[in-house]
């Protein structure tokens, strides 16, 4: 794969900040007349003014009227103004507003419920496999293996709290040390960020919306990946998280607290428990090598049980196996002892859809996975539609200004930190970072929140989820209190360390720039979003897992060359953008690489051929299916309300729309093909609430 898509053009001229043909040399101004061979086109390349030398962004000569794709769209209110309405119109508009609010809350409710059921579905499909990942003995010695297990398990069960609680129970049972648990917690942090990335995929229908939503979601991914990239080696070398948290745990004499308040669950549980109920202890039992648990179903059948503790006589091979010398006897043939057994009597069955079907977990999981994704997608579309109709004109302006405006000078820097606190608070209220960041994603997509503002909110969400874990730890039983609290604190300090790395200094806010770069690529090549998801959350972790199982020699043998190549590419890119003169002529651009290694165009052709069956006609029963179809094939036909029609933005795809505002692409090489942009589609005349 290319280090970045379309790297051929990225050749700045330090003397004049000019960019021309791919083959252009800094010392040869005449070369500017050459043609651009990157995209195999004959079109001449025009010289344009480049960014300052610290930037690697490729810009295209642009007409002034085209906006930066990252600028928030202005949602025009074409409705009748409030002052111009008569009493009847005002009343009607008021009730329309109330109706929209109720609908919005309703869809938001089902959106959150579908996220919960999606998590249950993932647990049913991959929960047992996730549990078996934990039973791998190499975790103790290999932090990298611990990390990828954390990622894979959290991706499979769609819940960092589930994977964290498994880790806690394993540490409490001395099956895992806190040192070995820390990389797993880091991995769980990465794994939990997949949820909002999946949610972002649902906004694939509209390119500009998708660009923002996908970037807004992946800013979380990049923050987590970059934090791990820096902090895992630091932790392995210094064990600072382990030491700090140990000091905290030992210095406080904690008494068992109360359970963390379930605020959102109180509202969603009545509905979700009618769909499916899971026995999450099964995954923990599998992780702890309980053979019996492997045959147990995750689907909870009995909700009311009576547990009776009784003593039974059991035979033992010898008197040495007796519970105690005084509880040992013989019948003349066999030795007997008395054992305390807990007898569980089933009283009442659970009241959920799957209770009497007796289907295998995989079948139930698959059904729920499909249904929850459909509901998730449907709710998201409706939320975006309702928000789109409400957030227009004056309302949009007020909300956008409130959310995205900084404090006045000299306190502007405080705004982001307030956003972190808001994100943490909101996550604490909803008790799930996935729910909060997933709710944030469509708002970024429709342009209510900027990525710059979403970033601190997401960071706050990471903190919020750890405070919930700390509260839950304080409510743990005595034997698990220390370990669960230490792990929760490790999670907390890991996120704090990450924020200190990637937030305070604007220059270090790499996740924003990386997410924007990925947003641009994915907006142009929508299949790349799915590719990114599979690569980062499945293939890379699975590859590392496989290599780790093969032994550290294999891992090092494969890993070191890969890491070396990545570092080499990054260094080369840095030199190409900052001081290309020091490089040999051939290395001053990426043209020495074959096209498939520096551009996504050949790959796009392959994907297009592969999904050719969809490309001719994309008729489908609903928009939900259409979005999935668009994502797969980037087809020129998309559905609108049960009929096939030309998608306006697809029709304009041929026009490579130039891009403005270089500062937003700071340090990211963006190709022309990643910059297709259209104005937001015009809205119908509708009543605006307010």
């Amino acid at each position: 794969m290319a280090p970045w898509p379309e790297l051929g053009d990225a050749q700045p001229n330090p003397d004049k900040y000019l960019e021309g043909a791919a083959g252009q040399q800094p010392t040869a101004p005449d070369k500017s007349k050459e043609t651009n061979k990157t995209d195999n086109t004959e079109a001449p390349v025009t010289k344009i003014e480049l960014l300052p030398s610290y930037s690697t962004a490729t810009l295209i000569d642009e007409p002034t009227e085209v906006d930066d794709p990252w600028n928030l769209p202005t949602l025009q209110d074409s409705g009748i103004k409030w002052s111009e309405r008569d009493t009847k119109g005002k009343i009607l508009c008021f009730f329309q507003g109330i109706g929209r609010l109720i609908l919005l809350l309703g869809f938001l409710y089902f959106f959150v419920c579908s996220l919960d059921i999606l998590s249950s579905a993932f647990q049913l499909v991959g929960g047992k496999m996730a549990g078996q990942f934990f039973s791998n003995s190499s975790i103790m010695s290999n932090p990298l293996l611990g990390l990828v297990i954390g990622v894979l398990v959290t991706v499979l069960v769609q819940s960092s709290s589930t994977s964290t609680s498994i880790v806690v129970s394993m540490v409490s049972s001395s099956l895992l040390t806190v040192r070995a648990a820390i990389p797993i917690i880091m991995g769980a942090n990465i794994g939990t960020s997949i949820t909002n990335t999946i949610v972002a995929l649902m906004q694939v229908g509209d390119r500009s919306e998708f660009r923002r939503a996908f970037a807004g979601a992946t800013v979380h991914d990049f923050f987590n990946w970059l934090s791990v990239l820096v902090l895992l080696p630091v932790e392995v070398a210094t064990h600072y998280l382990e030491i700090i948290t140990q000091l905290i745990v030992e210095s406080f004499h904690f008494k068992n607290g109360e359970d963390a308040p379930d605020l959102l669950k109180v509202i969603t549980k009545p509905f979700t428990k009618l769909i499916v109920q899971l026995d999450k202890k099964v995954i923990s039992q599998i992780a702890m090598n309980d053979e019996k648990a492997k045959n147990k179903s995750l689907v909870k059948i009995w909700c009311k049980t009576f547990t009776n503790k009784t003593q039974i006589n059991v035979t033992v091979p010898s008197t040495a196996n007796c519970t105690s010398p005084s509880l040992c006897w013989t019948d003349g043939i066999q030795n007997w002892t008395m054992k305390n057994v807990t007898y569980k009597e089933n009283i009442a069955k659970c009241q959920h859809i799957f209770v009497n079907f007796h289907l295998p977990d995989l079948a139930v999981g698959t059904i729920l996975l499909i249904l929850s994704l459909l509901v998730l997608c449907g709710c998201l579309i409706m939320i975006v539609k309702i928000l789109g109709s409400v957030l227009k004109g004056q309302v949009a302006t007020v909300i956008k200004k409130t959310i995205n405006t900084d404090f006045p000078f000299p306190f502007a820097w405080l705004t982001g930190y307030l956003a972190i606190l808001v994100g943490a608070g909101m996550t604490f209220i909803v008790q799930s970072s996935s729910v909060f960041t997933s709710a944030l994603t469509p708002l970024i997509g429709i342009g209510v929140i900027t990525i710059e503002r979403a970033y601190p909110l997401t960071l706050g969400s990471n903190i919020g989820t750890t405070t919930t874990a700390i509260l839950a730890a304080l409510a743990s039983p005595g034997n698990a209190l220390r370990s669960s609290l230490q792990i929760a604190l490790c999670h907390f300090f890991f996120n704090i360390s990450g924020i200190l790395l990637w937030y305070p200094i604007p220059f270090t806010r790499l996740p924003i720039r990386m997410a924007k770069g990925l947003g641009n690529i994915s907006a142009k090549y929508r299949w790349f979003a799915v590719f990114y998801l599979i690569i980062f959350f499945f293939l890379i972790p699975l590859t590392v897992f496989g290599l780790s199982l093969a032994g550290w020699r294999v891992l090092v043998g494969v890993g070191v060359p890969v890491v070396f190549i990545i570092i080499l590419v990054l260094c080369l890119r840095l030199l190409q953008s900052r001081c290309p003169r020091v490089l040999p002529k051939k290395l001053q651009n990426w043209n020495f690489l074959p096209l498939w290694m520096r551009s996504l165009k050949p790959w796009d052709a392959v994907v297009s051929k592969f999904t050719g069956c969809f490309q001719m006609r994309c008729c489908c029963c609903c928009r939900v299916c259409c979005r999935a179809c668009c994502l797969l094939c980037d087809c020129p036909k998309c559905c609108r309300c049960s009929k096939c029609c030309e998608d306006l933005e697809e029709a304009q795809e041929g026009q490579d729309v130039p891009v403005k505002a270089p500062e937003t692409f700071d340090n990211i090489t963006i190709s022309r093909e990643a910059q297709g942009e259209v104005p937001a589609s015009d809205s119908k005349t509708e009543c605006t609430a307010l």
Partner: antibody
Framework: QVQLVQSGAEVKKPGASVKVSCKTS????????MHWVRQAPGQGLEWIGA????????SYNQKFKGRVTMTADTSTSTVYMELSSLRSEDTAVYYC?????????????WGQGTLVTVSS | DIQMTQSPSSLSTSVGDRVTITCKAS??????VAWYQQKPGKSPKLLIY???TRHTGVPSRFSGSGSGTDFTLIISSLQPEDVATYYC?????????FGGGTKVEIK
Amino acid sequence: QVQLVQSGAEVKKPGASVKVSCKTSGYTFITYNMHWVRQAPGQGLEWIGAIYPGSGDTSYNQKFKGRVTMTADTSTSTVYMELSSLRSEDTAVYYCSISTIITTGAVDYWGQGTLVTVSS
Amino acid sequence: DIQMTQSPSSLSTSVGDRVTITCKASQDVGTAVAWYQQKPGKSPKLLIYWTSTRHTGVPSRFSGSGSGTDFTLIISSLQPEDVATYYCQQYSRIPLTFGGGTKVEIK
């Protein structure tokens, strides 16, 4: 009711073997362990061993190991105890007994006893 | 093997008297102790098991107590038919072992 009927008295020479039988009735033969206990004249009780007729599992007192063999015949609901290499100190009344108190070694039904005399 | 030491080896008392027989185990046997009564020329008869549980048909004047290593059989009011030899037995470990017996007579 439960009945344990033992074979008649035996007189044996030292070095010989004796096989005492215990025919049972009134209960399911394979259910309970059968114990053999002996009592030398004017002495206390001494446990020889036990057999579980259901599986043929046996357990012997180390003192008699290698000399004692217990067998069960489920077709006749009879248990046999054979003691070899007899010595004069083996002269005793041999009792078969069962424990219907499941899992315990407390025996609650006894045979009438078989007197085995070892003399040259 | 676990040794069971019974005392006294014999005792002579009057009808209606309270009789106490003790049994000491050489090691902890929990409560896995039984008491037997053997009349002259007869087979032993189970009186008590699990230290204190009376067997079916055993009169209530017979009671047992103790745990660990010290056990007691009490005949609250001696009757003429109680003249016999009494044995304690442990079934905590194989081999099962009996006490030497206590001969109870009436004066």
